[in-house]
Every structure is written in C-alpha cells, then in structure tokens.
C-alpha cells in the first residue's frame, strides 16, 4: 500500500524518492506520474527527467527542488489543491533489464487545519504509522499522532525513497494544541 | 502521420536467428517506449519485449528472455528485434508498437512481419 | 500473472444491435485497461485506453466502462465495419497481458 503525505490546500506538497546514482553523477531517467505505476513508464506524466536534467514538466507547479544530480528526485508540488489528491508514481528507470524502480505515493490535501486548543488528544488518527503533514519548502512537516508513542524519529527506507516522521516542536506540545486532520 | 514499417521476417530453421527491424516516422521516436507484440496464426496477441525512449531499459516476456534482444537506433527512428535460438512456437507475425506516452496502452501498430520457424 | 478473460468468445450480432463485450482480470489491474479492434489480416487498432477513453479518432458508439476486475465494451449500435475480433489488455501487473478475444460475427 502505498505511504500517504497530507498537504494543505495553497501549501506546497512535497513527495520524497531518491536513488543513489553509481557511479556518482551516473544519472538516469526518472519520471514522476499521476496514478499508480503502470508495468512501463508513468501514467499522466507531471515531471520526466532524462540523464542530465528535467526535460518535461506538465505545469510550472512541478519541480525537483533536492540536489537532483545527487539522485534526490522528490517531487514538490506548489500551491496544492483539491484537484492535486491522489496516487503518484515515482519511476527510476536504471538501466539493464527490468531495473526500474517504482514507489507509488498517496497525497492527502486538505483544507488548512485549525490549531485548536485540546483538552484532551484527540484519536482520530490510529494508524500505527502516521500519516505525514507536509507544508514546507522542501521537508515534511512536523505532525503528530495523539495518543500513540512518544517523540519518535523514525525514518523508514525502501529502495529509493526515506520518510521521516517527526513529533510536535515543543511549543505547540506545551501550548496543548493539536492538529486536527480528520 | 505516425506510421511504423516492420520487415525482417521469414523462413528460420529451428535454433537459428533472425533479425527484425520498425521503421518509424511520424512522432518524436526517441521519447516512446516501442513494443514487439506477436501473434501465432489464428491465436491471440502476445506481447514480447519493449524498450524505453533512451534505450536505457529493456523488458521481456518470460518466453523470450535470454533469447531474444530488443533495441533501437534513435538517430535512424529503428527499432530492432534480435531473435535467437529460434523455436517453432515462435512462429507468429510480430508487431512493433508505439506507447501512448503514458505506460499503459499502444496507440499505434505496424503492419506487421511473418516469422516462420521450421525445418 | 495477470489473467484476462474474455466473454463471450463468440458474439453472434445483427448490423445496428448493441454489442457487450466483458474482461474479467484474475486479479485487480486498476483502470490501466485497453480495448484493441482486429479485423483479418491487419494489426490491431486501439478503441479505448484507461477503462474508458476513447482513443483519437474513434467513433462514440464505442465506450468502455469498468475498474479494478470487471471491464466492459460496449458497441451501442454495430455498423458492418465492427464485426472483428476484440481484445482487452492490461498493463498494471506484470507482465502485460492480453485476453484471448471475443468475435463479433454477423449473425
């Protein structure tokens, strides 16, 4: 199943993948699409990059803003809307026979969430993995998942692509607020 | 308009080569994945092999693979299907078909060239 | 693999009566799904892609329709040029495979 990322409506989406390119600076041809990875290529094409740089990108809203040489091919989508929700597929197609690697991405965009003040945590997200709250530049976003664990840093690894996960920053933690995603 | 042009086929011993070529023209042959699909006479279709834009990546059938070799020459606008190793269940019309341009269907086909394989 | 099966194999049908053409997947291929038309002797011809997407140049009376394991064609009202054999393929799961066929004869 694929990891889901929650945006908010205006902010921009940021959907991790990566491959370490060998030797350094020995790019291939990725592709990012919307819709799940079909046996070849990508479906609806957003952004295509070849072994030097991007050669297609559907809107201007599409960029690969990591260190694309160093095999950094996250996806950012800015100023994200209703319509940006669904399944996406990052394809990197290293060379050879049936090399490709493919990650399916699911983003979430929501309306902007309120920071409210909680008496209690709320428990509406019970997913023992969490579901991620992206709205900066070029990370995710801190978000927290009430009732579970404590702080936790933990950072899952396929293939190509890393997650990481974050907790509260202590000041929100200490004002008792929340973020109410549902 | 797009057209795709295969020629190569004919008569092949068993355990013998053969070497198909898809001329194309038309499009912007060097973004496309290019298929080989077959079809035994009076069976169904069969695909083979494909071959992403750059000639980066190539795919097989189970049936094929280490047998048959899928290129292309994007200064030529060729594809090419190397067959070796030729067996009788290979008898089939192959077909060289271009990719939609999203992964998940051929829009357009060639002709098609008969490849026989008998003693 | 991905299984893709064909119903009926054989469609006995009258010029302007509606055809119904059904693809079953042994296991869920989403909607990366196509229709081909082929008529004897020539090469396939793409009707419909994604489940339900007519392909350029195609006539509306064809449609697709489906998701997930069950895909339907459907022809609202066969002209004498869509007698031919038709064939479903998926490219969600590999490898790529393609139905058998259906036959739409002239009854």
């Known amino acids: 199943s694929e990891v889901e990322y929650i945006a908010e409506v205006g902010q921009n989406a940021y959907l991790p993948c990566s491959y370490t390119p060998a030797p350094p600076g020995n790019l291939v041809p990725v592709c990012w699409g919307k819709g799940a990875c079909p046996v070849f290529d990508c479906s609806n094409v957003v952004l295509r990059t070849d072994n030097r740089d991007v050669n297609d990108r559907t809107s201007g809203r599409y960029w690969l803003k990591g260190d694309f040489h160093k095999g950094d091919v996250s996806l950012t989508i800015e100023n994200v809307t209703l319509a940006d929700s669904g399944v996406y597929c990052c394809r990197i197609q290293i060379p050879g026979i049936m090399n490709d690697e493919k990650h399916n991405v699911k983003l979430v965009v929501i309306k902007p969430a309120k920071v409210t003040p909680a008496p209690t945590l709320q428990r509406d997200l019970t997913s023992a993995f969490p579901r991620m709250l992206t709205t900066g530049e070029h990370g995710p976003a801190e978000t927290q998942t009430p009732g579970s664990l404590p702080d936790v840093n933990l950072t899952v690894s396929n293939f190509f692509c890393e997650l990481q996960i974050f907790t509260l920053t202590n000041e929100l933690r200490d004002s008792g607020a929340t973020i109410r995603t549902a | 308009e797009v057209q795709l042009l295969e020629s190569g086929g004919g008569l092949v011993q068993p355990g013998g080569s053969l070497r198909l070529s898809c001329a194309a023209s038309?499009?912007?042959?060097?973004?496309?994945?290019i298929s080989w699909v077959r079809q035994a006479p009076g069976k169904g279709l069969e695909w083979v092999a494909a071959?992403?834009?750059?000639?980066?990546?190539?795919y097989y059938a189970d049936s094929v693979k280490g047998r048959f070799i899928i290129s292309r020459d994007n200064s030529k606008n060729t594809l090419f299907l190397q067959m070796n190793s030729l067996r009788a269940e290979d008898t089939a019309v192959y077909y060289c078909?271009?990719?939609?341009?999203?992964?998940?269907?051929?829009?357009?086909w060639g002709q098609g060239t008969l490849v026989t394989v008998s003693s | 693999e991905t299984v893709l099966t064909q119903s009926p194999v054989t469609l006995s049908l009258s010029p302007g009566e509606r055809a119904t053409l059904s693809c079953r997947a042994s296991q869920s291929v989403g909607s990366y799904l196509a229709w081909y038309q082929q008529k004897p002797g020539q090469a396939p011809r793409l009707l419909i892609y994604d489940a339900s997407n007519r392909a350029t140049g195609i006539p509306a009376r064809f449609s697709g329709s489906g998701s997930g394991t069950d895909f339907t064609l459907t022809i609202s009202s066969l002209e004498p040029e869509d007698f031919a054999v038709y064939y479903c393929q998926q490219r969600s799961n590999w490898p790529p495979t393609f139905g058998q066929g259906t036959k739409v004869e002239i009854k």
């Open positions: 071959i992403t834009g750059s000639g980066g990546s190539t």
């Open positions: 078909a271009k990719d939609g341009g999203s992964g998940s269907y051929d829009d357009f």
């Open positions: 038309g499009f912007t042959f060097r973004t496309h994945l």
